[in-house]
Interface confidence: low
C-alpha cells in the first residue's frame, strides 16, 4: 500500500501557501484528485510529488494515491483544506443527474473544517428544502440527498455560517430522472366487443408511463388509425388515451384491434376482437350430458353455458316434474360471468330426494328471443326386496318383488337352517332369474320387477332368500317356512331411507 507524506489524514493551509504531497510505493504510483489549477507533478519511479506554490480554495479536496501494479489495489488518501475566509465552499460540479431512489451527492466541499457545525443545504433564493428531504453532510464530500425523488429536481446551494452570517456556494442543479421500468403499461377496453350492425361502439386504447416520452397508436387489422390523442398526468404517471367512436357499425368495422405503445425500453401491444352481427343471438349449451343419473342422496350441479348479445333480460331454472310442483331454490342457482358475452349458470342440487328426479329446464331471454335447455335427471336407488308365499295355478310359489334403479337382477338362494341371510356354507341351491317380469318402468321412477320360484314342497328346516342387486347396491329378503305357515324376514340392516 502506498504511503503519503505528510502522513496525516487532513491538512489545513491558508490561501497562497505552498503545499507538497509526496506518495511513495513499491512500484510506480499515480495521483487522483479534484480537477484544480496550479498543481505540478514530479515522478521518479516509485514516488510521485504533487505540489503548488499558491494554494487556492479550489485545491480543497481529497487526493488519493494508488499503485496500479498492486494486486490488492491498495490506496492512500489525504484531504486538503484551503481555508479562504471569503470562500467557504469549493463546488466540484454544478449539475448532478441521478435516477429516482438513488443517493444524490451535491459536491460542495467545505474549505475550513471549523465551519462544519454551521452548514446547511437550501434551495436557491433561500427557500427551504422540500418536506421529507432526507440528507446528510460530509465535509470531505458535500451534501447527500438520500433516495432522491423526481420532485426533488431543484437548484440547491450549500450554506455555511461565517462570522454570524450565511455564505452560500454557487448553485448546483439536481436532476432526478424517473426510472423507466419497461415499455408503457397498456389497457385496451373492452377486451372483446360484439355489436349489431347499425349500433354504436367505442374502443379505448390507453397507455401510461412514469416518463412522458412514449408513443401510442391504435390499429385495425394492420391499418394504423388516425385518432386524436388525449394526454393526462395523474398518480405520478403520464397517460395518453386514444378513443375510437363508431356511431353506426358495419361489417367492415369488425376485426382485430391492437393498441401499441413504445418508449426507449421497448414496445408493448395488446389486442381485442370486434364482432359485428346481423341480429341478436342467444345460444345455450352444456358440457354435461343432458341425461343425468345420480344416486339418491348425492348432489349434482347442472351447468349451462350462455353466449348472448345483447345481455340477458331474464333467466331462471324451472322444474318441469313429474313429481312435486316444487321449484329450485334461488339460493342454489349461481351465475358467473366468464366475460361480457359468455356466462355460466349453475343449479346446485345437494342431497337429492326422490321427489327431485325429473326434468330441469334453464330458460333465458334476450332481445333475440327465448331459449331453453332441459336436463333429465333420473335417480339411482339400491333395490328394495319383499317375498310372499302364494299359490299360482295350484302350485306353491314364492313371489319376489324388487324395486330399484337401474333395473335390479334377481337371484334365489336355498340354504339349510333358519337364517336372515344365507351364507356360503349354508347354500344348497342358487337360481339366477335372467328375465324377471317388469311390473312398472315409468320415466324417473324406480323399476319394479317380479320373480317367481315354484316350490313343490317347502322344506321346513330351510330358508329361501331372494337377492336383488344393481349398480347402486343390493337388497334381500329371507323366507322361512314354519309349520304354522310361512314366515318372512327382511334383513335387519336393510332399512333404506334416502
Amino acid at each position: 500500500i502506498p504511503v503519503i507524506e505528510p502522513s496525516v489524514p487532513e491538512l489545513v493551509v491558508k490561501p497562497g501557501a505552498t503545499v507538497t504531497l509526496r506518495c511513495v510505493g513499491n512500484g510506480s504510483v499515480e495521483w487522483d484528485g479534484p480537477p484544480s489549477p496550479h498543481w505540478t507533478l514530479y515522478s521518479d519511479g516509485s514516488s510521485s510529488i504533487l505540489s503548488t506554490n499558491n494554494a487556492t480554495f479550489q485545491n480543497t479536496g481529497t487526493y488519493r494515491c494508488t499503485e496500479p501494479g498492486d494486486p490488492l489495489g491498495g490506496s492512500a488518501a489525504i484531504h486538503l483544506y484551503v481555508k479562504d475566509p471569503a470562500r467557504p465552499w469549493n463546488v466540484l460540479a454544478q449539475e448532478v443527474v441521478v435516477f429516482e431512489d438513488q443517493d444524490a451527492l451535491l459536491p460542495c466541499l467545505l474549505t475550513d473544517p471549523v465551519l462544519e457545525a454551521g452548514v446547511s443545504l437550501v434551495r436557491v433564493r433561500g427557500r427551504p428544502l422540500m418536506r421529507h428531504t432526507n440528507y446528510s453532510f460530509s465535509p470531505w464530500h458535500g451534501f447527500t440527498i438520500h433516495r432522491a425523488k423526481f420532485i426533488q429536481s431543484q437548484d440547491y446551494q450549500c450554506s455555511a455560517l461565517m462570522g454570524g452570517r450565511k455564505v452560500m456556494s454557487i448553485s448546483i442543479r439536481l436532476k432526478v430522472q424517473k426510472v423507466i421500468p419497461g415499455p408503457p403499461a397498456l389497457t385496451l377496453v373492452p377486451a372483446e366487443l360484439v355489436r349489431i350492425r347499425g349500433e354504436a361502439a367505442q374502443i379505448v386504447c390507453s397507455a401510461s408511463s412514469v416518463d412522458v416520452n412514449f408513443d401510442v397508436f391504435l390499429q385495425h387489422n394492420n391499418t394504423k388509425l388516425a385518432i386524436p390523442q388525449q394526454s393526462d398526468f395523474h398518480n405520478n404517471r403520464y397517460q395518453k388515451v386514444l378513443t375510437l367512436n363508431l356511431d353506426q357499425v358495419d361489417f367492415q368495422h369488425a376485426g382485430n384491434y391492437s393498441c401499441v405503445a413504445s418508449n426507449v425500453q421497448g414496445k408493448h401491444s395488446t389486442s381485442m376482437f370486434f364482432r359485428v352481427v346481423e341480429s341478436a343471438y342467444l345460444n345455450l349449451s352444456s358440457e354435461q350430458n343432458l341425461i343425468q343419473e345420480v344416486t339418491v342422496g348425492e348432489g349434482l350441479n347442472l351447468k349451462v353455458m350462455v353466449e348472448a348479445y345483447p345481455g340477458l333480460q331474464g333467466f331462471n331454472w324451472t322444474y318441469l316434474g313429474p313429481f312435486s310442483d316444487h321449484q329450485p331454490e334461488p339460493k342454489l342457482a349461481n351465475a358467473t360471468t366468464k366475460d361480457t358475452y359468455r356466462h355460466t349458470f349453475t343449479l346446485s342440487l345437494p342431497r337429492l330426494k326422490p321427489s327431485e328426479a325429473g326434468r330441469y329446464s334453464f330458460l333465458a331471454r334476450n332481445p333475440g328471443g327465448w331459449r331453453a335447455l332441459t336436463f333429465e335427471l333420473t335417480l339411482r336407488y339400491p333395490p328394495e326386496v319383499s317375498v310372499i308365499w302364494t299359490f299360482i295355478n295350484g302350485s306353491g310359489t314364492l313371489l319376489c318383488a324388487a324395486s330399484g334403479y337401474p333395473q335390479p337382477n334377481v337371484t334365489w338362494l336355498q340354504c339349510s337352517g333358519h337364517t336372515d341371510r344365507c351364507d356360503e356354507a349354508q347354500v344348497l341351491q342358487v337360481w339366477d332369474d335372467p328375465y324377471p317380469e317388469v311390473l312398472s318402468q315409468e320415466p324417473f321412477h324406480k323399476v319394479t320387477v317380479q320373480s317367481l320360484l315354484t316350490v313343490e314342497t317347502l322344506e321346513h328346516n330351510q330358508t329361501y332368500e331372494c337377492r336383488a342387486h344393481n349398480s347402486v347396491g343390493s337388497g334381500s329378503w329371507a323366507f322361512i317356512p314354519i309349520s304354522a305357515g310361512a314366515h318372512t324376514h327382511p334383513p335387519d340392516e336393510f332399512l333404506f331411507t334416502p
Partner: antibody, heavy 120, light 112 residues
C-alpha cells in the same frame, strides 16, 4: 365424491427443495381455481398460493414469492407446488383446496394435508 | 394487505347454549357485485379445515342450519344457535376479496 389427496411432503434440509402434488377427483378440475394453504405446528392457517383454472392468473404470499412455484396439469387433474430454498419457517402441514369458479373464491373442499419439515 | 381480527380467541360454551364469533377486517370486503368476500371455516381436532359459510351468509352444503353468518363491510359474525359437542374446534374467518388472501387468528370453541 369430490376428493383432494396431497403427497410429496417429508423431511428436507434448509436450502433444499421439495415438490408437492395434489390429485383431484370427482369434479371437473379444469373449471376451478386451486389453492395451497399451510399451517405451522400449533399455529393458524396461512394462504400460500393460488392458480386460476387455466393457469392465466397466479398469486403468491409475500413469504414464499420467488421461492415457490404453483402449477397445474388439467389433463391429469393435478396441482403442484415446487418449493425451493426452503427455510425452517416453511415447516407446516400443506393443504390443497379447491377454489370457487371465477369470481368466487371460497375454499371447498380441502385435502387431508401433507407435512413438510425443514430441519438440519 | 387486509388484516383479519377475530374475537374472542377462546370460547367455552355449554351444550345447547348459543355462541357467536366476531371477525373484523381492516378494509371493506364488500365487492361492487354486492357480495361480501368473507368465508368461515371450521377445523375440528386432527382434521382438515371445512367450509361452513361462504360470501358472509351462505351455508355450505351439508352444514347444519344452526350455523349462520351475517355482517357487511368490515364487521362479520358467525352464530351457532345451539352448540353441540361435535362443534368443537377452531373457527377461522377468511377474506378472498384480494390477494394475499388472509385468515383471522382463529377462535377455539370448547365445551364447558
Amino acid at each position: 365424491e369430490v376428493q383432494l389427496v396431497e403427497s410429496g411432503g417429508g423431511l428436507v434440509k434448509p436450502g433444499g427443495s421439495l415438490r408437492l402434488s395434489c390429485a383431484a377427483s370427482g369434479f371437473t378440475f379444469s373449471s376451478y381455481s386451486m389453492n395451497w394453504v399451510r399451517q405451522a405446528p400449533g399455529k393458524g392457517l396461512e394462504w400460500v398460493s393460488s392458480i386460476s383454472s387455466s393457469s392465466s392468473y397466479i398469486y403468491y404470499a409475500d413469504s414464499v414469492k420467488g421461492r415457490f412455484t404453483i402449477s397445474r396439469d388439467n389433463a391429469k387433474n393435478s396441482l403442484f407446488l415446487q418449493m425451493n430454498s426452503l427455510r425452517a419457517e416453511d415447516t407446516a402441514v400443506y393443504y390443497c383446496a379447491r377454489g370457487g369458479s371465477f369470481p368466487y373464491n371460497w375454499f371447498d373442499p380441502w385435502g387431508q394435508g401433507t407435512l413438510v419439515t425443514v430441519s438440519s | 394487505d387486509i388484516v383479519m381480527t377475530q374475537s374472542p380467541l377462546s370460547l367455552p360454551v355449554t351444550p345447547g347454549e348459543p355462541a357467536s364469533i366476531s371477525c373484523r377486517s381492516s378494509q371493506s370486503l364488500l365487492h361492487s357485485n354486492g357480495y361480501n368476500y368473507l368465508d368461515w371455516y371450521l377445523q375440528k381436532p386432527g382434521q382438515s379445515p371445512q367450509l361452513l359459510i361462504y360470501l358472509d351468509s351462505n351455508r355450505a352444503s351439508g352444514v347444519p342450519d344452526r350455523f349462520s353468518g351475517s355482517g357487511s363491510g368490515t364487521d362479520f359474525t358467525l352464530r351457532i344457535s345451539r352448540v353441540e359437542a361435535e362443534d368443537v374446534g377452531v373457527y377461522y374467518c377468511m377474506q378472498t376479496l384480494q390477494t394475499p388472501y388472509t385468515f383471522g387468528q382463529g377462535t377455539k370453541l370448547e365445551i364447558k
